[in-house]
């Protein structure tokens, strides 16, 4: 490790004085940064030697003394303090900059270590410093402002007192950047716009940033627009603003618009699209099919698309019947907007009844016409299912006729015994019916169909049942020939 | 909620001193700065001065250097105000006032304490 | 110390109209756009209220009917539509530099 001569830590000389500062290594070694011209500087052997003949107070300050061959890396400080009565401050800088919530050095040094208890920090022109400035003092390195604040950026003096008067340095102005987290924050608004031919139109684009060096500008399609900038400060935030107002918007005028801003750590750009229209224009559509089957006690929701500029001027939910002329209660209609042209709306049919089915019709108006898009919507019922006895032609015949919809198939089987319902094990044969008649089919009704099982003798001891199927589910009747007649039963559910 | 308790009214004589109460709940106590303000008929409202709880640093409005002393008790967040030689100049009531502290440097006092009336009579 | 000097004393004002408040500084109060000037709302009986932060900043729970602006040395607190609750004295206050400063108040009656 180097040693400097004299020993120090500190040296407090007059002005005018010679100062010799010899440093002695074992190797060669060097002072520390730039050294000012008032200084001489030669080698002796290992040792390096500064020279003044003439000491002023701005010679005041802390020199340091390295060993680069030195593997510790090791070094040997002095701080030379030149007390000069008029000037009780060498300041080593007239601007400091540094970041938010860094510490910041305000490097004036006290030429006279005996004046330490006198010093304080204070504004340009003897202003307080900022409610809250929190700071330290080093005779050595000069005040320090903890981690300082933008608002703390201001023009600094550094005073001391003597002879019972303030002395004040030279100022230094501190400078205190915003960290900046990233490119400025935009707004584009609208997201969209549409506009019939001939009317005006406003895009705005906004940018906001941390500090106030950051640009901005709209662009359409590829070219930048020339627009004025307005500039503003809320929120701790920097705002510029730029408003593009068209009176009256053509063809040339659709298109893509950008909003891009940038700063030192970036771009960032957000887009909107502008389609020019001749006319009004509503449209509607579902992704729903728009006939719909559902089985009877559950629920639908028919959901509507609406496209729509300008904006709607009414809407609502129509049913057209067949069955009766309730209305959808307006409880059960929702609408949400996607965004500033599309709609969806909604008509929610909990636990359908069977006076339910029919068509359901959404109008909506603006001032392109009104537009109607129609559901039909059908219940599925499972079959039910009843047979008689009856004679056709002279011939004894049981009639089976069962309802549902879908349209029911029909399967007859006799089995032995006597019993409410075929099983698997008894059944003795089986008939399909592949073309059972239709008796009624109406729009939005369960569809009857009958069939019939012509038998010449029935034979006593034995079962014939009806049975009926669809997509929803299955019923049956069950025969049973008797002496005296003949008897019919129902299955139990 | 954040409420600063004060301690009750004082009716002191002349001459005499008094210590005011402040405990603050439902706040970090120690991010803040706790002020004390004097409120009196003639004078309107005026800052005594504050403390910064996490290492009772104070500081003071030189017209109440030498009359008021603040202190406070991290264990128990509470911060006293003492004042001494007290003349009917000092019958006031006496708020403590928490200041917050925000990036941007807004100091403000947003939640104050209900007031400390203090009566200064022989 | 930074003097601020509120006007008017005392104001009165028809219920839904609007009141406006005036505190002038003795010296500048603001720096690098931040202005440093706070209002507070004092009903009798009761300690004082934060209402606005930063000349323009409303405190969170205030409602919307109180405004402020203002820069450097001049600043308002505006109040639009008065309500019969909004009687109260209303003060101003720095933060800029030690020692912290208050207006003489303003008081408003509701007519």
């Known amino acids: 490790i180097p040693v400097i001569e004299p020993s120090g830590p500190e040296l407090v000389v007059k002005p005018g004085e010679t100062v010799t500062l010899r440093c002695v290594g074992n190797g060669s070694v060097e002072w520390d940064g730039p050294i000012s011209p008032h200084w001489t500087l030669y080698s002796d052997g290992p040792s390096s030697v500064l020279t003044t003949n003439n000491a002023t107070f701005q010679n005041t300050r802390t020199y340091r003394c390295t060993e680069p061959g030195d593997p510790l890396g090791g070094s040997a400080a002095i701080h030379l303090y030149v007390k000069d009565p008029a000037r009780p401050w060498n300041v080593l800088a007239k601007e400091v900059v540094v970041f938010e919530d860094q510490d910041a050095l305000l490097p004036c040094l006290l030429t006279d270590p005996v004046l330490e208890a006198g010093v304080s920090l204070v504004r340009l022109r003897g202003r307080p410093l900022l409610r809250h400035t929190n700071y330290s003092f080093s005779p050595w390195h000069g005040f320090i402002i903890h981690r300082a604040k933008f608002i703390q950026g201001q023009d600094y003096q550094c005073s001391a007192l003597m002879g019972g008067r303030k002395v004040m340095s030279i100022s230094i102005r501190l400078k205190v950047q915003k960290v900046i987290p990233g490119p400025p924050a935009l707004t584009l608004v609208p997201a969209e716009l549409v506009r019939i031919r001939g009317e005006a139109a406003q895009i705005v684009c906004s940018a906001s940033n941390i500090d106030v060096d950051f640009d901005v500008f709209l662009q359409h399609n590829t070219t930048k627009l020339a627009i004025p900038q307005r500039s503003d400060f809320h929120d701790n935030r920097y705002q510029k603003v730029l408003t593009l107002s068209l009176g009256q918007v053509d063809f040339q005028h659709a298109g893509n618009y950008s909003c891009v801003a940038s700063n030192v750590q970036g771009k960032h750009s957000t887009s909107m699209f502008f389609q020019v229209v001749e006319s009004a224009y509503l449209d509607l559509s579902s992704e729903q099919n728009l006939i719909q089957e559902v089985t009877v006690g559950e629920g639908l929701n028919l959901k509507v698309m609406v496209e729509a500029y300008p904006g709607l001027q009414g809407f609502n939910w129509t049913y057209l019947g067949p069955f009766s002329d309730h209305q959808p209660e307006p409880k059960l209609a929702n609408a949400t907007t996607k965004d500033t042209y599309r709609h969806t709306f909604t008509l929610s049919l909990p636990r359908l009844k069977p006076s339910e089915a029919g068509r359901y019709s959404f109008l909506a108006r603006n001032p392109g016409g009104w537009r109607a898009l129609t559901f039909e919507l059908t219940l599925r019922y499972p079959p039910e299912v009843s047979v008689i006895w009856t004679s056709i032609n002279g011939s004894g015949t049981l009639l089976c006729a069962a309802s549902g919809y879908p349209q029911p198939n029909v399967t007859w089987l006799q089995c032995a015994g006597h019993t409410d319902r075929c099983d698997e094990a008894q059944v003795l044969q089986v008939w399909v019916d592949p073309h059972p008649e239709v008796l009624s089919q109406e729009p939005f009704q369960k569809v009857t169909v009958q069939s019939l099982l012509t038998a010449e003798t029935l034979e006593h001891n034995q079962t014939y049942e009806c049975r009926a199927h669809n997509s929803v589910g299955s019923g049956s009747w069950a025969f049973i020939p008797i002496s005296a007649g003949a008897r019919t039963h129902p299955p139990d559910e | 909620e954040v409420q600063l308790q004060q301690s009750g009214p004082e009716l002191v004589k002349p001459g005499a001193s008094v210590k005011i109460s402040c405990t603050a709940s439902a706040i970090t106590f120690t991010d803040y700065y706790m002020n004390w303000v004097k409120q009196s008929p003639g004078k309107g409202l005026e800052w005594i001065g504050d403390?910064?709880?996490?290492?009772?640093?104070?500081t003071y409005n030189q017209k109440f250097k030498g009359k008021a002393t603040l202190t406070v008790d991290k264990s128990s967040t509470t911060a006293y105000m003492e004042l001494r030689s007290l003349t009917s100049e000092d019958s006031a009531v006496y708020y403590c006032?928490?200041?917050?502290?925000?990036?941007?440097?807004?100091?403000?006092?947003?939640?104050w304490g209900q007031g400390t009336s203090v009566t200064v009579s022989s | 110390d930074i003097v601020l000097t509120q006007s008017p004393a005392s104001l009165a004002v028809s219920l839904g109209q609007r009141a406006t408040i005036s505190c002038r500084a003795s010296?500048?109060?603001?720096?690098?756009?931040?202005?440093?000037i706070h209002w507070y709302q004092q009903k009798p009986g009761q300690s004082p209220k934060l209402l606005i932060y930063?000349?323009?900043s409303l405190e969170s729970g205030v409602p919307a009917r109180f405004s402020g602006s203002g820069s450097a040395t001049d600043f308002t607190l505006n109040i639009h539509p008065v309500e019969e609750e909004d009687a109260a004295t209303y003060f101003c206050?720095?933060?800029?530099?030690?020692?912290?400063?208050f207006g003489g108040g303003t008081k408003l009656e509701i007519k």
């Open positions: 403390i910064y709880p996490n290492n009772g640093g104070t």
């Open positions: 930063a000349a323009s």
């Open positions: 006032a928490r200041e917050k502290i925000t990036m941007e440097y807004y100091y403000a006092m947003d939640y």
């Open positions: 010296e500048s109060v603001s720096s690098h756009d931040i202005h440093l």
């Open positions: 206050q720095q933060s800029i530099e030690d020692p912290p400063t």
